[in-house]
């Protein structure tokens, strides 16, 4: 369980958080997903990144840095002024996050036009768009702090980047594999179930016959199915116990004003872990 920090602690100075939950310690919860989230650190008076496990935890957890700052830093919205830079950012800096179609797990960086910062995202390993950098420095150099008045040579190079009509993207799932999503609006963070638990059983592409289990979200139970040994999706577990442990926790009851809600939520960042398929 989360502990609340003591507001009277002398190290904290006089700054009071906007909400009591901003004083709570970061709580990754008992689950094992790896979801990049942000919390307000009462000791540094800053919003910082932490890795959320995907269930339970507390309310001091935000999907974006901006949302954390707006919620927990007094006067943040008044003082947050757009950086006045005469330099033009290439158009691809404003492209939405696109993890592509593949199922790899590559750590990349993109410029987030909402937070005006370069942030980490998970790239699937193919396709996508040009708002995709190998290093944070490269992203910052090109999109956060572009150099002033580029030379004519640079202008010619940048024209290559002006438009990217490459993608029309529905980013919730790709190949039935869950991919990162950038939430557009602040929302209540209750519990987010693992999205692959909502996928249908998929026997895959090969010819083997292996006994596996999948979570049936309609019945709330794990059922047996035959897996052919390759392909398929992540709703695929070697034992019923593993299946239940991974997916059953996706349905938790949140008491809110006396009403019991059952919520399933897609996690904005999910580390996809593959059981061996070859």
């Amino acid at each position: 369980l989360s502990e609340e920090a003591d507001d009277t602690d002398s190290e904290l100075g006089s700054m009071k958080p906007l909400h009591t939950f901003c004083a709570m310690k970061a709580d990754d919860g008992p689950c094992k997903a790896m979801i990049r989230s942000y919390f307000f650190n009462m000791y540094t008076h800053q919003c910082e990144e932490f890795i959320y496990g995907g269930c339970e935890g507390n309310e001091n957890r935000f999907d974006t840095l901006e949302e954390c700052k707006k919620t927990c830093i007094p006067g943040y919205e008044k003082t947050a002024v757009k950086a006045a830079s005469g330099a033009e950012r290439p158009d691809f800096c404003f492209l939405e996050e696109d993890p592509g179609l593949c199922r790899g797990y590559m750590k990349r960086y993109l410029y987030n036009n909402q937070t005006k910062q370069c942030e980490r995202f998970v790239y699937g390993g193919c396709l996508g768009n040009r708002n995709n950098f190998e290093t944070l420095d490269e992203c910052k150099k090109i999109c956060e702090n572009p150099v002033h008045s580029p030379s004519p040579v640079n202008e010619v190079q940048m024209s290559d980047y002006v438009t990217d009509g490459n993608t029309v993207t529905d980013r919730s799932t790709v190949n039935n594999i869950v991919v990162p999503q950038s939430p557009k609006v602040p929302r209540r963070r209750d519990y987010r179930g693992r999205p692959w638990c909502l996928q249908p059983a998929d026997s895959g592409l090969c010819k083997a016959s292996e006994r596996r289990f999948y979570y049936n979200s309609a019945t709330g139970k794990c059922h047996r199915f035959n897996y052919t040994g390759c392909g398929g999706n992540n709703n695929n577990f070697t034992t019923r116990r593993r299946c239940l442990r991974s997916c059953k926790t996706g349905l938790i009851k949140n008491k809110s004003k006396g009403v019991v809600k059952i919520q399933r939520r897609k996690a904005p960042f999910v580390k996809v872990v593959y059981e061996s398929i070859n």
Partner: antibody
Framework: EVQLLESGGGLVQPGGSLRLSCAAS????????MSWVRQAPGKGLEWVSA????????YYADSVKGRFTISRDNSKNTLYLQMNSLRAEDTAVYYC?????????????WGQGTMVTVSS | QSVLTQPPSVSGAPGQRVTISCTGS?????????VHWYQQLPGTAPKLLIY???NRPSGVPDRFSGSKSGTSASLAITGLQAEDEADYYC????????????FGGGTKLTVLG
Amino acid sequence: EVQLLESGGGLVQPGGSLRLSCAASGFTFSSYAMSWVRQAPGKGLEWVSAISGSGGSTYYADSVKGRFTISRDNSKNTLYLQMNSLRAEDTAVYYCAILGATSLSAFDIWGQGTMVTVSS
Amino acid sequence: QSVLTQPPSVSGAPGQRVTISCTGSSSNIGAGYDVHWYQQLPGTAPKLLIYGNSNRPSGVPDRFSGSKSGTSASLAITGLQAEDEADYYCQSYDSSLSGSGVFGGGTKLTVLG
């Protein structure tokens, strides 16, 4: 058995249109991204286009962007490539392939191909 | 001009070992993208031979192996057999092309004798 069967190729004049189909069987079609790859006579392979399992995300090579449209009908287990404003350099065998099925990002399984000839 | 560079041809006698190189750049192989290899026998469609730099799909003999280092990759074939005579293509993705798929120009393997 997993099978991909392309059709719709043929002879077409420059500026004309053609629609290729790829009928898939033996696997859960809607679960996989699909791609088109082409090979000009006596030449190497060239990636053309790709589409996500849901059909919500599409990608194109610069050489065909604005002229070709990839789509899929998951109820019919069929992948399509609508080719407009065809040019002589589009002459090739067109293959459909499953993308990232047993691998993470390779073209795992290929169809036998359909020949498209653009000539006046 | 292909984004990935392969030698146009290689040859070897039965039982020998041959390697085919695939040279890229910092925007493709060097950017962390996987390299895949395909075999195309005469008059047939390409077939996946090696995926993810060094993995063999089921059914591919262990005479075929792949490796990747820096901005290049290579395919090695040991114990060369007559039926290995084919075109071999490497493939990856390129960040300067919005992550588009890119292929090598292909290498024709001739088994001598």
